[in-house]
């Protein structure tokens, strides 16, 4: 006769492991007992369980409640056992020793591999600001057995570096993603992808990038100076900028206080019907937590009466 078993049995942490051991014997042969033992190198064989044809299933106190025979129907030549709720410490070599009548004893070894799926964690790096050099955007760590694979999925251009720490029964892998921050990266996803044989599918953790920046400020509304004349209604200046975090706007007048009737509405400065009093230098001050910018414009409100007088003077001068 001969023993049929597996070289390697692989289970995920917490699953039940079936340790196979089947005696393929000649007709008339009987199995008296099947003894299962841990057979790791450097330690004496530690009995796990013993299936006896007459006395039944015996279980080592160290494995009490965790070793069972497979559910019926059972073949009397089948010495397989179930190891319930596999833990990392169960990983190792096991020996099945079958005592038969009249052929004698047979033994076989198998290796139990317990996969420990990783629980990845993603840690964002320091605040990203435009103008920085190569900066850590995020690091992703996953520990498992065997060592997991940690990669990045993103449209953002960057560099990755990985390091691994081996523990007694597992390994921790940390991957870092570095980039040169730019405003175009704002809102872009950076996804850590963890692969492992104990996972049905890759685990993914996504971090949304936030890059602090503040664009140059500019003022719109003075494109046509001829519209800025005495009596015009609805005249306004609009301050243009963008930033992360979104900036706040403040309007001042360089050569004095804002004239009465001028309304500040965020990025917009609204004027009442224009008078020459509204002429002056206006400053838009844009700021966020990252930076601040200024843009100034000169408003020159034309008085048609003065203009016509000047024109007459010019004509008469010629």
């Amino acid at each position: 006769g001969e023993l049929e078993t597996s070289d390697v049995v692989t289970v995920v942490l917490g699953q039940d492991a079936k340790l196979p051991c089947f005696y393929r014997g000649d007709s008339g042969e009987q199995v008296g007992q099947v003894a299962w033992a841990r057979a790791d190198a450097g330690e004496g064989a530690q009995e796990l369980a013993l299936l006896h044809s007459k006395y039944g299933l015996h279980v080592s106190p160290a494995y009490e409640g965790r070793v069972e025979q497979p559910p019926p129907p059972r073949n009397p030549l089948d010495g397989s056992v179930l190891l319930r709720n596999a833990v990392q410490a169960d990983e190792g070599e096991y020996e099945c020793r079958v005592s038969t009548f009249p052929a004698g004893s047979f033994q076989a070894r198998l290796r139990l591999r317990v996969l420990v799926p990783p629980l990845p964690s993603l840690n964002p790096g320091p605040a990203l600001e435009e103008g920085q050099g190569l900066t850590l955007a995020a690091s992703c760590t996953a520990e498992g057995s065997p060592a997991p694979s940690v990669t990045w999925d993103t449209e953002v251009k960057g560099t990755t570096s990985s390091r691994s720490f081996k523990h007694s029964r597992s390994a921790a892998v940390t991957s870092e993603f570095h980039l040169v921050p730019s405003r175009s990266m704002n809102g872009q996803p950076l996804t850590c992808v963890v692969s492992h044989p104990g996972l049905l599918q890759d685990q993914r953790i996504t971090h949304i990038l936030h890059v602090s920046f503040l664009a140059e400020a500019s003022v719109r509304g003075l494109e046509d100076q001829n519209l800025w004349h005495v009596g015009r209604e609805g005249a306004m200046l609009k301050c243009l900028s963008e930033g992360q975090p979104p900036p706040s706007y403040n309007w001042t007048r360089l050569d004095g206080p804002l004239p009465s009737g001028v309304r500040v509405d965020g990025d917009t400065l609204g004027f009442p019907p224009l008078t020459t009093e509204h002429s002056g230098i206006y400053v838009c001050h844009v700021s966020n937590e990252f930076s601040s910018r200024d843009s100034q414009v000169t408003v020159d409100v034309l008085d048609p009466q003065e203009d016509s007088g000047k024109q007459v003077d010019l004509v008469s001068a010629s």
Epitope: G32, A35, H52, H58, S60
Partner: nanobody, 122 residues
């Protein structure tokens, strides 16, 4: 030929304790499983508890948590500590064992002792 000699039986009140011993002799080979069966009047012989030379245990559901089996391999002796005894534990308790043969093969023969009476009654 293996001889099994039991001792420790007797009369005990419900809730009491007894300790049975069984010594195996006459064997030049390794004793494999040792343990205890019992037979109440008019009933079939049933397993109580057995223990392997490697220390693995097998208990009948009816005695789990009350009875403890232990073994001294060097002395080829098995013990059964019986606590919280009940009237239904009344029976003749038989020691049992098997052994490996001269080539290290398991012998198909099961050996039995003469039995020791345990009576639980008030």
């Amino acid at each position: 030929q293996v001889q099994l000699v039991e001792s420790g039986g007797g009369l005990v009140q419900p809730g009491g304790s007894l300790r049975l011993s069984c010594a195996a002799s006459g064997s030049d080979f390794t004793i494999n499983v040792m343990g205890w069966y019992r037979q109440a009047p008019g009933k079939q012989r049933e397993l109580v508890a057995t223990v392997t030379s490697g220390g693995s245990l097998n208990y009948a559901d009816s005695v789990k948590g009350r009875f403890t089996i232990s073994r001294d391999n060097a002395k080829n002796t098995v013990y059964l500590q019986m606590n919280s005894l009940k009237p239904e534990d009344t029976a003749v308790y038989y020691c049992t064992a098997d052994q490996f043969g001269p080539l290290g093969h398991l012998s198909p023969i099961i050996y039995w002792g003469q039995g020791t009476q345990v009576t639980v009654s008030s």
